[in-house]
């Protein structure tokens, strides 16, 4: 399986909300002994590979933000802890999973990573990640709403 990031760049005004999205692609084994662990964290374009470093998102670690379930089941993180920090991560039945960040500040700018771990009990873990950049802007040059740039090209879309 693979992880796709529909958008590689999100440019948002300060104070706006944004939802960063990843999508699980390809055949997904839904067997009894296969489960999925999904999470989000901040990172940098590291020397080993992008997303190899795991930093907190608004003080919440990847452990705090994880989703756990088998196959394509829907799941959500612990509401209380995440929502106190203006965060919510969720997953649907179609392989999409996301993190919503509310009331963006300049400090939220940076590289964000989604991580999917396919756990094949008795065999191994298979890790796949996706990366996307968030730029939070302020002042007269900031967009009025979030502008997203698809991963495949640099055509932008405005999110209202």
């Amino acid at each position: 399986f693979k992880v796709a990031t529909p958008y590689s760049l999100y440019v948002c005004p300060e104070g706006q909300n944004v939802t960063l999205t990843c999508r699980l692609l390809g055949p997904v084994d839904k067997g009894h002994d296969v489960t999925f662990y999904k999470t989000w964290y901040r990172s940098s374009r590291g020397e080993v590979q992008t997303c190899s470093e795991r930093r907190p998102i608004r003080q919440l670690t990847f452990q705090d933000l994880h989703l756990h379930h088998g196959g394509h089941q829907a799941a959500q993180t612990s509401h209380d802890l995440a929502q106190r920090h203006g965060l919510e991560s969720a997953s649907d039945h179609h392989g999409n999973f996301s993190i919503t960040m509310r009331n963006l500040t300049l400090l939220d700018s940076g590289l964000y990573c989604c991580l999917v771990v396919e756990i094949r009990h008795h065999h191994s873990e298979h890790r796949v990640h996706g990366a996307m950049e968030l730029q939070v802007q302020t002042g007269k040059d900031a967009p009025s709403n979030c502008v997203v740039y698809p991963s495949s090209s640099q055509d932008s879309e405005q999110i209202t």
């Epitope: 662990y37 080993v48 452990q63 994880h66 991580l115 890790r127």
Partner: antibody
Framework: QVQLQESGPGLVKPSETLSLTCTVS????????WSWIRQPPGKGLEWIGY???????NYNPSLKSRVTISVDTSKSQFSLKLSSVTAADTAVYYC???????????WGQGTMVIVSS | EIVLTQSPATLSLSPGERATLSCRAS??????LAWYQQKPGQAPRLLIY???NRATGIPARFSGSGSGTDFTLTISSLEPEDFAVYYC?????????FGGGTKVEIK
């Protein structure tokens, strides 16, 4: 803050079954791997196996025929049973939380189990 | 199973010196390797995950490097509390395995 506490008899007779319980406090047991690891006196660490929150288990092949790990989510506990023990099973037994694609980040303090008649 | 070999078995150094510990895997583990510190009578403590990332609260004097089969844990300047046994552990496949340990002792 999540804490782990092992409990169980410190002395087991040869050929009997070693039974230990790990109680998870300060957090949910409904995620992650919950593992048992042991350390014979003066030696290194050996992973025994885990139970995933979903109930899936995975055991070290070297011990698989003798090991059972189970979970009781209502009590926030998971347990180890090791059958047909010998003196070679004398060790400090640790329970630990293992996060997928990460590491053993939280450990119990360990409990010494001696196998002797 | 993957065998991890640590060297040296014992490292005798003085406080303030640099410690370099090695861990070699019998086959590639990518960068999926962790390091733990264990003091007498205590449980191991996670220091490094994914070969080079420090765990929460671990001082900057601890650093990890390597990928594939050869890994290094470096303690840039030994503090008195750093004298302990250090273990590496792989998680690319099950069974999860640990190295035999390196004891860092006071010279």
């Amino acid at each position: 803050q999540v804490q782990l506490q092992e409990s169980g008899p410190g002395l087991v007779k040869p050929s009997e079954t070693l039974s230990l319980t790990c109680t998870v406090s300060g957090g949910s047991i409904s995620s992650y791997y919950w593992s048992w690891i042991r350390q014979p006196p003066g030696k290194g660490l050996e992973w025994i196996g885990y139970i995933y929150y979903s109930g899936s288990t995975n055991y070290n092949p070297s011990l698989k025929s003798r090991v059972t790990i189970s979970v009781d989510t209502s009590k926030s506990q998971f347990s180890l049973k090791l059958s047909s023990v010998t003196a070679a099973d004398t060790a400090v037994y640790y329970c630990a939380r293992d996060i997928p694609a990460f590491a053993f980040d939280i450990w119990g303090q360990g409990t010494m189990v001696i196998v002797s008649s | 199973e993957i065998v991890l070999t640590q060297s040296p078995a014992t490292l005798s150094l003085s406080p303030g010196e640099r410690a370099t510990l090695s861990c070699r895997a019998s086959q590639s583990v990518n960068y999926y390797l962790a390091w733990y510190q264990q003091k007498p009578g205590q449980a191991p403590r996670l220091l490094i995950y994914d070969a080079f990332n420090r765990a929460t609260g671990i001082p900057a004097r601890f650093s990890g490097s390597g990928s594939g089969t050869d890994f290094t844990l470096t303690i840039s300047s030994l503090e008195p509390e750093d004298f302990a046994v250090y273990y590496c552990q792989q998680r690319i496949s099950w069974p999860l395995t640990f190295g035999g340990g390196t004891k860092v002792e006071i010279k």
